[in-house]
């Protein structure tokens, strides 16, 4: 059986302040069952940006319908980008459990924020 891979195709993305940023992520397998989560940063301060199954993330929307069967596109769109949103974002696959167990992370996409065009 093929090993699960989490693919973040872009190493970096640059967005003007006030615009939306799309962060792309796909998985190569639906197995094992479990959610995708998006984080900014690594280590103790790793910040949860989006959880596929729970939580309230008003500025973040999935690009594809997460309820759709066989969906393997876990890309997200973050609206109204500000300089404070800069950083490296990671798409991470978890195995369902109590608690969920981290399986595989994408390589990360660095988001940089350009000044708003005048």
């Amino acid at each position: 059986e093929e090993e699960l891979q989490v693919i973040q195709p872009e190493k970096s993305v640059s967005v003007a302040a006030g615009e939306s940023a799309t962060l792309n992520c796909t998985a190569t397998s639906l197995i094992p069952v479990g959610p995708i989560q998006w984080f900014r940063g690594v280590g103790p301060g790793r910040e949860l940006i989006y959880h596929q199954k729970e939580g309230h993330f008003p500025r973040v929307t999935p690009v594809s319908d997460p309820t759709k069967r066989n969906n393997m596109d876990f890309s997200i769109r973050i609206s109204n980008i500000t300089p404070a949103d800069a950083g490296t974002y990671y798409c991470v696959k978890f195995r369902k459990g109590s608690p969920d167990v981290e399986l595989k992370s994408g390589a990360g996409t660095e988001l940089s924020v350009r000044a708003k065009p005048s």
């Epitope: 301060g45 790793r46 910040e47 949860l48 940006i49």
Partner: antibody, heavy 117, light 108 residues
């Protein structure tokens, strides 16, 4: 406004246990890393432990195996269970919010732990 | 473990003057260095992160610079409320996160 309020400090004997709590408000607690940093009397700052937004835990070598960090996201509370306490654990223990880039942007006022026979 | 050495231990400065504090790392921290201020009986307060980015609400008289292993916190036009202990912290390697030993800025 972000607020962090520690409690649970006190005086204990060597070998005893204590549990510290940190009540957080003013931000979405479950999304962020939280940490404990201590300061022995008249000394500098020492990082003790952290819990990431995904629940991963991290410890300084000096407390590994004796201290356990945990969090209750439903109660917006961070904990530090301290077992087998030693005289050198005597310090003010600060609860701090950790940014995505691993520095500390908000701190509580601290709670004093004294380990003495 | 990345070790941070701060110098001097104590700095005596007159109000209105400039204070220059140094933090040296035992290895390259890729610019991930923060500075905190701590007054007696108070919790630390974040001043600077990522070498030179001021935290919210921090006055412009506080500035950070440096690269590689050597970093500087400069306070221009010292005010009475700036007399305190200052700590650096590297946020490059989290195993473990480490602080410098501190520099006390006192009134001359």
């Amino acid at each position: 406004d972000v607020q962090l309020v520690e409690s649970g400090g006190g005086v204990v004997r060597p070998g005893e246990s204590l549990r510290l709590s940190c009540a957080a408000s003013g931000f979405t607690f479950r999304n962020y890393g939280m940490s404990w940093v201590r300061q022995a009397p008249g000394e500098g700052l020492e990082w003790v432990s952290a819990s990431s937004g995904s629940g991963s835990t991290y410890y300084a070598d000096s407390v590994k195996g004796r201290f356990t960090i945990s969090r209750d996201n439903s109660k917006n509370t961070l904990y530090l269970q301290m077992n087998s306490l030693r005289a050198e654990d005597t310090a003010i223990y600060y609860c701090a919010k950790v940014t995505w880039n691993n520095f500390f942007d908000y701190w509580g006022l601290g709670t004093l732990v004294t380990v003495s026979s | 473990e990345i070790v941070l050495a701060q110098s001097p231990d104590t700095l005596s400065v007159s109000p209105g003057e400039r204070a220059t504090l140094t933090c040296r790392a035992s290895q390259d921290v890729a610019g991930k260095l923060a500075w905190y201020q701590q007054k007696p009986g108070q919790a630390p307060r974040l001043l600077i992160h990522a070498t030179s980015s001021r935290a919210d609400g921090i006055p412009a008289r506080f500035s950070g610079s440096g690269s590689g292993t050597e970093f500087t916190l400069t306070i221009t036009g010292l005010q009475s409320e700036d007399f305190a202990v200052y700590y650096c912290q590297q946020h490059y390697d989290w195993s473990p996160l480490t602080f410098g030993g501190g520099t006390k800025v006192e009134i001359k």
